[in-house]
Amino acid sequence: SEVEYRAEVGQNAYLPCFYTPAAPGNLVPVCWGKGACPVFECGNVVLRTDERDVNYWTSRYWLNGDFRKGDVSLTIENVTLADSGIYCCRIQIPGIMNDEKFNLKLVIKPAKVTPAPTRQRDFTAAFPRMLTTRGHGPAETQTLGSLPDINLTQISTLANELRDSRLANDLRDSGATIRIG
């Protein structure tokens, strides 16, 4: 069955997928799709690479790692509950039926906010979940707290940076990896 990964609403979700190129720069096409891997290709493609570059992507979906070294892990920006589901990472190795397919289950949960002890102003109305997030580790809490002169975009960016660094560290070692060549 699928490996399950979790994120909270407003975070950037990270779905790990790796392969080892036969030689540096000798890349293999990869596709990411929403939905379980079909017999061929990816359904509902959200991102695709070819032998040289990322040649197709949709908003909020990107590769954060070095895909030229085989890190084709998918980052989904600013997730909502509707981003939950099965995602397919398909490494399209040349030859008949040689593709490696990985189904990853992404479960998004409502974000949990610890009330900041100091004044919060009114930006909680637009981003009620952005001020404080509870992390994935045991008893881990990351607090942005009182931010007197900062706009919503900065709050969102700062929150995502905190989350991304944590998620990448937490999940990088648990991803699907194959060696080619």
Partner: antibody
């Protein structure tokens, strides 16, 4: 998918409080958030709030803050909605609903409890 | 709060018909929408989640579509058990908010 059981009806006096129960069975209670919803005839549906049974974390509709309190008892796999200072406006059917496997918040519903506030 | 405007409020249809119910959100809700069914005097059943996905056990004659702020529930080849009230609900933002409902009646 499991089941959610709620008592059929509660009659309470104005000014009193009532604690409504929603007993879960057939699934892992602490794995899924629970929602509470109010339905009044001709008034549509109102979301009251949600609770994560794994750690008692709650989110409330601001319109129900001070009126509603959500709790859980994991030992009996039961979620509770307490309503305080009841008035005739609180007479309604109250439903619990739990999320589904892919974070669908309103996947499975209890049968609802009819609360009647009457002296 | 996000306002969910559902239409029509009621419709009379015949067995075997195909019907669509529309929900318009007051802002982009990014497919964070569910569709619910309530039979007279009964509780609710989840039909569709995340805009297009069928809840477990829901017949394939139900389907959901849409994006941005506009979504629809379509029921093809109506059966007698489909005559009920239908509601949409958004969950992209707090508080969760519901449409006003659509009553499907037999013509």
């Amino acid at each position: 998918q499991g089941q959610l059981q709620q008592p059929g009806a509660e009659v309470v006096k104005p000014g009193a409080a009532v604690k409504l129960s929603c007993k879960a069975s057939g699934y892992t209670f602490t794995s899924y958030w629970m929602q509470w919803i109010k339905q009044r005839p001709g008034q549509g549906l109102e979301w009251i709030g949600e609770i994560d049974p794994s750690d008692n974390y709650t989110d409330y509709n601001q319109n129900f803050k001070g009126k509603a309190t959500l709790t859980v008892d994991t030992s009996s796999s039961t979620a509770y909605l307490q309503l305080s200072s009841l008035t005739s406006e609180d007479s309604a059917v109250y439903y619990c609903a739990r999320e589904g496997a892919f974070s669908s918040p309103f996947a499975y519903w209890g049968p609802g409890t009819l609360v009647t506030v009457s002296s | 709060d996000i306002l969910m405007t559902q239409s029509p409020s009621s419709m009379s249809v015949s067995l075997g018909d195909t019907v669509s119910i529309i929900c318009h959100a007051s802002q982009d809700i990014r497919s964070n929408i569910g569709w619910l069914q309530q039979k007279p005097g009964k509780s609710f059943k989840g039909l569709i989640y995340h805009g297009t996905n069928l809840e477990d056990g829901v017949p394939s004659r139900f389907s959901g579509s849409g994006s941005g702020a506009d979504y629809s529930l379509t029921i093809s080849s109506l059966e007698s058990e489909d005559f009920a009230d239908y509601y949409c609900v958004q969950y992209v933002q707090f508080p969760r908010t519901f449409g006003g409902g659509t009553k499907l009646e037999i013509k």
